[in-house]
């Protein structure tokens, strides 16, 4: 009695069960009462990846360089060629028939996952405490600058697109203000001295005075900080004098490079 169903890897034809062709081979002749199914190997540019009764092998996929494709894995008689995209591109679909450039993450967004030949860039919004000010397919969100670690204070808050702006603290502000105040005082004192000298040269009256040796007057002796041995003073922003700490140079601090 002719079979109605066949074993695995067989097919029913002309009331008999014939063996399917193995992967890498195509069907040429069905089995007969006397011979097994005749199968032929696929040619070099063809493949069949399953047990089959196909009379033609499938052509290997062509990785078209004009579409940005290149061969990732060469096809065999049993497997298709696997294409991938050139650097900077990724597949448009799962079948990878053409490629498109990787997406860049806009400012305010950072790269969560860098693109591959088969997947696009995955962007994520920069969370609080992070920012991205560039459009990039590689850069992650960067953390805001920590002003504290540089002995600075936040002068302008950061956003998802901008970094924080750090500024000097009160003490550092003093280092800027003190020399300015000192400079102003010095100029005033000079002006006063010049004025006093001019006044001193004017004759008081017409009566003659006894001739006196001109006495050198050092007006600077009374000026605060004129003693070279004494510590240089600093002033706070209120222009009140403060003593310069030992071991510190009396100069405006230069902010370190990041």
């Amino acid at each position: 009695e002719p079979p109605t169903a066949c074993r695995e890897k067989q097919y029913l034809i002309n009331s008999q069960c014939c063996s399917l062709c193995q992967p890498g081979q195509k069907l040429v002749s069905d089995c007969t009462e006397f011979t097994e199914t005749e199968c032929l190997p696929c040619s070099e540019s063809e493949f069949l990846d399953t047990w089959n009764r196909e009379t033609r092998c499938h052509q290997h996929k062509y990785c078209d360089p004009n579409l940005g494709l290149r061969v990732q894995q060469k096809g065999t008689s049993e497997t298709d060629t696997i294409c991938t995209c050139e650097e900077g591109l990724h597949c448009m679909s799962e079948s990878c028939e053409s490629c498109v450039p990787h997406r860049s993450c806009l400012p305010g967004f950072g790269v969560k996952q860098i693109a591959t030949g088969v997947s696009d860039t995955i962007c994520e919004p920069c969370p609080v405490g992070f920012f991205s000010n560039v459009s990039s397919a590689f850069e992650k969100c960067r953390p805001w600058t920590s002003c504290e670690t540089k002995d600075l204070v936040v002068q302008q808050a950061g956003t998802n697109k901008t970094d924080v702006v750090c500024g000097p603290q009160d003490r550092q502000r003093a280092l800027v203000v003190i020399p300015i105040c000192l400079g102003i005082l010095f100029v005033i004192l000079l002006l006063v001295l010049v004025f006093i000298k001019k006044v001193a040269k004017k004759p008081n009256d017409k009566a003659p005075h006894p001739k006196q040796e001109p006495q050198e007057i050092n007006f600077l002796d009374d000026l605060p900080g004129s003693n070279p041995a004494a510590p240089v003073q600093e002033t706070l922003h209120g222009c009140q004098p403060v003593t310069q700490e030992d071991g510190k140079e009396s100069r405006i601090s230069v902010q370190e490079r990041q």
Epitope: S19, V28, S29, T32, E33, T35, E36, E38
Partner: antibody
């Protein structure tokens, strides 16, 4: 009506060659593997060659490998057997067969 | 693969009797897919062989139902339920499962 008709046999000297032909009709020739079977006088049948339906695969017993060549022309429904380096023991009636059907045979005699 | 038939030479029978011929292969001729290419042929005097049974037990078209085949693995049998005069000749078993294909030595069915 299936018909297989051999030709090309004859008397040949040892070391000589012949090309046997078999004209097939009455069935779809290309779908069937074809064989040549020989029979020496008063002896058993001996299978000497087979070719697959497409002509791609060929099979021989060790006794004739390298000396006999089976081939087919599916366009003309013809089977061939080229026999060379013939020996006296190759003397036999050569049958063309699809296993289901057999021709009447052609006689090959190898003699000095 | 060696195919051994018995009786080895002849089997004398009376017309109308049952006849049985055995064939044993030196190794299994069952393929992994379950197919067994065991065939039985009858060669009448002066004729080419004719197919009777294929794949162990399948009667070829036009073969009378008094012929039946059975067996598996390495042991096979051809039975003729009621022998008729036209059945006389030499019976050969043949294995087409493994190259080189081989025939049995033949059993001559003759009248007692």
């Amino acid at each position: 009506q299936v018909k297989l008709e051999e030709s090309g046999g004859g008397l040949v000297k040892p070391g000589g060659s012949l090309k046997l032909s078999c004209a097939a009709s009455g069935f779809t020739f290309r779908n069937y593997a074809m064989s040549w079977v020989r029979q020496s006088p008063g002896e058993r049948l001996e299978w000497v060659a087979e070719v697959s339906g497409s002509g791609y695969y060929t099979y021989y017993p060790d006794t004739v490998t390298g000396r006999f060549t089976i081939s087919r022309d599916n366009a003309n429904n013809t089977l061939y057997l080229e026999v060379s380096s013939l020996r006296s023991e190759d003397t036999a009636m050569y049958y063309c067969t699809s296993r289901a059907y057999w021709g009447q045979g052609t006689l090959v005699t190898v003699s000095a | 693969i060696v195919m051994t038939q018995s009786p080895t030479l002849s089997l004398p029978v009376s017309l109308g009797d049952q006849a049985s011929i055995s064939c044993r292969s030196s190794q299994s001729i069952v393929l992994t897919n379950g197919n067994t290419y065991l065939e039985w042929y009858l060669q009448r005097p002066g004729q080419s062989p004719k197919l009777l049974i294929y794949k162990v037990s399948n009667r070829f078209s036009g073969v009378p139902d008094r012929f039946s085949g059975s067996g598996s693995g390495t042991d096979f049998t051809l039975k003729i339920s009621r022998v008729e005069a036209e059945d006389l000749g030499v019976y050969y078993c043949f294995q087409g499962s493994h190259v080189p294909y081989t025939f049995g030595g033949g059993t001559k069915l003759e009248i007692k």
